[in-house]
Interface confidence: low
């Protein structure tokens, strides 16, 4: 869609005559008829396929035509078309004399024609006017013309419709060729896509208007590059949304359970080693010479009866010293120079020869231990009672006297959820703020240690000195069969040659 514009500039008819040569009386009151049509090699009569327009009387004989575009739009003359401009045309301009006020063709005498011009050619759409002048024997017409597109039409043929907009359907103005030119901050084929804030995360962020960065669920921060941890996550972080990966020393679903009582409270005294054993519980491993829940009590190093085989313990400033009975030697009198002939096994222990009689091993009756069955089993030496419980020897067994708030064989349970012993197969119950947790012994799994999983007690290679390991499947324990020259439950002690004694 566009408009063919014709600007009449000057008409010269000095003698004031008609095309027939007859003069106009009193002068030639001149008006114009314009016919615009498709291109014809020879312009011939016929329909004005692109349109027609007529002017009022513009002057008498010779006159300049005023540019009247601002006041009514009669000059330039407008010939609108609503099709693709073909680029070629034919134009007929006729000058007529109007004896009266009626300018209709049928009201004029046939010889009222003053002059007629016809041109044809190519014409591209554009803002520039083409100036032309046509001269006949008696008249001269100066005019210019051009083709421009109607509002919202663009392109070489005025065939591209483009209407600037700034709404949900697009944010653009139109270029001279009809292509869209996005308004600042918008992009895409129809300029509907906003350009997000610089650095806004491609996947986790988006925007609905320019320079904005809105976060998708689970993400936060100015550029939507920070994940949101699980709601209620206290001492934890995330790498993807809704995670709660606990900081060191914290546990539980929301990382709100203090698993590092040792670090946070340093309860163990006198250089003892602290081990976390569940939420808010711990165990102190005392250095030699100390005892107590927190290793706060000093003891004689001989109190732990370190000397075996009847050796006598002597306290020294820097530790202790074992005075071994005849036939024994070593730091703890652990090595024997005796054989079964010397009846080395105390308390009814049975003697078994080893290494063709060069060595022996004692098999102790219940409640006795040591390489010569010399020690009554003190089941409290391993400090088995947790959470500050006091260990008491009771004949062949032991028992733990628990501090208030704890229960269980080893005082390992907090009184509350763990009171009903929910953990099967000897699982250790930990009382948490929002429930309990079972720590299962080897060979068991599941929330309550209810699932039995077979384990190979020999998998950790517990036997030394190339001893053969056997797994007892009924108890999931191991037995080491020692080669000649080694003794001990793990075959860890070599049997040396008898030293020379002074007695």
């Amino acid at each position: 869609s566009g408009v063919f514009q014709l600007q009449l500039q000057e008409f010269i008819n000095e003698r004031g005559v008609l095309a027939s040569g007859r003069p106009c009386e009193p002068g030639c009151r001149t008006f114009f008829r314009v016919c615009l049509k498709h291109f014809q090699a020879v312009v011939s009569p016929g329909p004005c396929t692109f349109g027609t327009v007529s002017t009022p009387v513009l002057g008498t004989n010779s006159f300049a035509v005023r540019d009247d575009s601002s006041g009514g739009g009669r000059n330039p003359l407008q010939l609108p078309f609503n099709f693709t401009w073909p680029g070629t045309f034919s134009l007929i301009i006729e000058a007529w004399h109007a004896p009266g006020d009626d300018l209709r063709p049928e009201a004029l005498p046939p010889d009222a024609l003053i002059s007629k011009i016809a041109i044809q050619g190519s014409l591209a759409v554009g803002q520039n006017w083409l100036l032309d002048e046509q001269t006949s024997t008696l008249t001269r017409l100066r005019y210019s013309y051009r083709v421009i597109c109607s509002d919202n039409y663009y392109g070489d043929n005025c065939s591209r419709l483009c209407k600037k907009r700034n709404d949900h359907f697009g944010h653009y103005v139109c270029q001279p060729d009809g292509n869209l030119s996005c308004l600042p901050g918008w992009t895409g084929e129809y300029c509907q896509q906003p350009i997000c804030l610089s650095g806004c995360h491609e996947q986790n962020g988006y925007c609905s208007k320019p320079a904005e960065c809105l976060c998708r669920p689970g993400w936060q921060g100015r550029l939507c590059n920070e994940c949101i941890p699980h709601n209620g996550c206290r001492h934890g972080t995330c790498s993807t949304p809704w995670q709660c990966t606990c900081d060191e020393g914290w546990g539980g679903l929301f990382c709100d359970q203090d698993l590092n009582y040792c670090t946070h409270h340093s309860p163990c005294k006198n250089g003892a080693t602290c081990s976390n054993s569940g939420q808010r519980s711990y165990t102190c491993t005392c250095r030699p010479g100390y005892t107590g829940v927190d290793c706060e009590l000093e003891l004689s190093e001989c109190d732990s009866n370190p000397c075996r085989n009847g050796g006598s313990c002597k306290d020294q400033e820097d530790g202790y010293h074992c005075l071994c009975p005849p036939g024994y030697y070593g730091l703890h009198c652990e090595h024997s120079t005796l054989s079964c002939a010397d009846s080395p096994c105390f308390n009814g222990g049975s003697c078994r020869e080893r290494n063709q009689g060069a060595n022996y091993a004692c098999e102790c009756p219940p409640n006795f231990t040591g390489s010569n069955c010399e020690k009554k089993v003190d089941r409290c030496t391993s400090n088995p009672c947790a959470n500050g419980g006091q260990c008491l020897n009771r004949g062949p067994s032991r028992m733990c006297r628990c501090r208030p708030g704890f229960t269980g064989t080893y005082c390992e349970l907090h009184v509350s959820d763990c009171a009903r012993n929910p953990c099967a197969h000897g699982g250790t119950c930990h009382d948490l703020e929002n429930g309990l947790m079972c720590t299962c012994p080897a060979g068991f799994s599941g929330r309550r240690c209810e699932v039995r999983t077979s384990i190979d007690a020999c998998a950790s290679s517990p036997c030394f000195n190339r001893a053969t390991c056997y797994t007892d499947l009924s108890t999931d324990t191991f037995v080491c069969n020692c080669p000649y020259g080694f003794v001990g439950s793990r075959c860890e002690f070599p049997v040396g040659l008898p030293p020379s004694f002074p007695w």
Partner: antibody
């Protein structure tokens, strides 16, 4: 003829601010954007951000986010870029360029403004 | 951020030779958002190619842009003395918009 004319050379002390202007002519300023690019001596081109002369929206490169402000004055068809808390490594030629929104290319460019930061 | 890597860093050729300059993006970008600029000493950059393959107004047809995805190329068919300069590629598919480090085309 479309062109951008920038303000002249500036010498600043560390910690100071600089405001460079860029006057546009030959096109409808408010239907376009202005982008700012800098070039340190002997180095490549570094994009700093853009401003829409249409509605004042801005997009700054993260590196400059805390100390840059871009503005426009549509009555004079002028864009401004202010950089605060200047450091010696801000010494560079600062260019403005018209931003053609539907394809994001920069054409034409201003002649450049040399900013020297030295104590 | 998308990193644009140009190669070679320097190209030494004689007038009349052909030149091929490469630009690689660290991730795929639409060719619509890839431009090439020429910069001569002491001057502002000048737009050569936009949309990966369209010559800007007034740019001679000896300059040709091609490529898609992550690999783009600027080809100069017959070097004229005035073509010796630094060439930069630039992407604006993803904010922040980034330039390559440049290829210096020098006379051998």
């Amino acid at each position: 003829q479309v062109q951008l004319v920038q303000s002249g050379t500036e010498v600043k002390k560390p910690g100071a601010s600089v405001k460079v202007s860029c006057k546009a002519s030959g096109y409808t300023f408010s239907y376009n954007g202005v982008t700012w690019v800098r070039q340190a001596p002997g180095q490549g081109l570094e994009w700093m951000g853009w401003i829409s002369a249409y509605d004042g929206n801005t997009d700054y490169a993260q590196k400059f986010q805390d100390r840059i402000t871009m503005t426009t004055d549509t009555s004079t068809s002028t864009a401004y870029m202010e950089l605060r808390s200047l450091r010696s490594d801000d010494t560079a030629v600062y260019y403005c360029a018209r931003y053609s929104w539907n394809n994001h290319w920069f054409d034409p460019w201003g002649q450049g403004t040399l900013v020297t930061v030295s104590s | 951020d998308i990193v644009m890597t140009q190669s070679p860093g320097t190209l030494s050729l004689s007038p009349g030779d052909g030149a091929t300059l490469s630009c690689r993006a660290s991730q795929s970008v639409s060719g619509s958002y890839l431009a090439w600029y020429q910069q001569k000493p002491g001057q502002a950059p000048r737009l050569l190619i936009y949309g990966a393959s369209n010559r800007a107004t007034g740019i001679p047809d000896r300059f040709t842009g091609s490529g898609s995805g992550t690999d783009f190329t600027l080809t100069i068919s017959r070097l004229e003395p005035e073509d010796f300069a630094v060439y930069f590629c630039q992407q604006s598919a993803f904010s922040p918009w980034t330039f390559g480090q440049g290829t210096k085309l020098e006379i051998k």
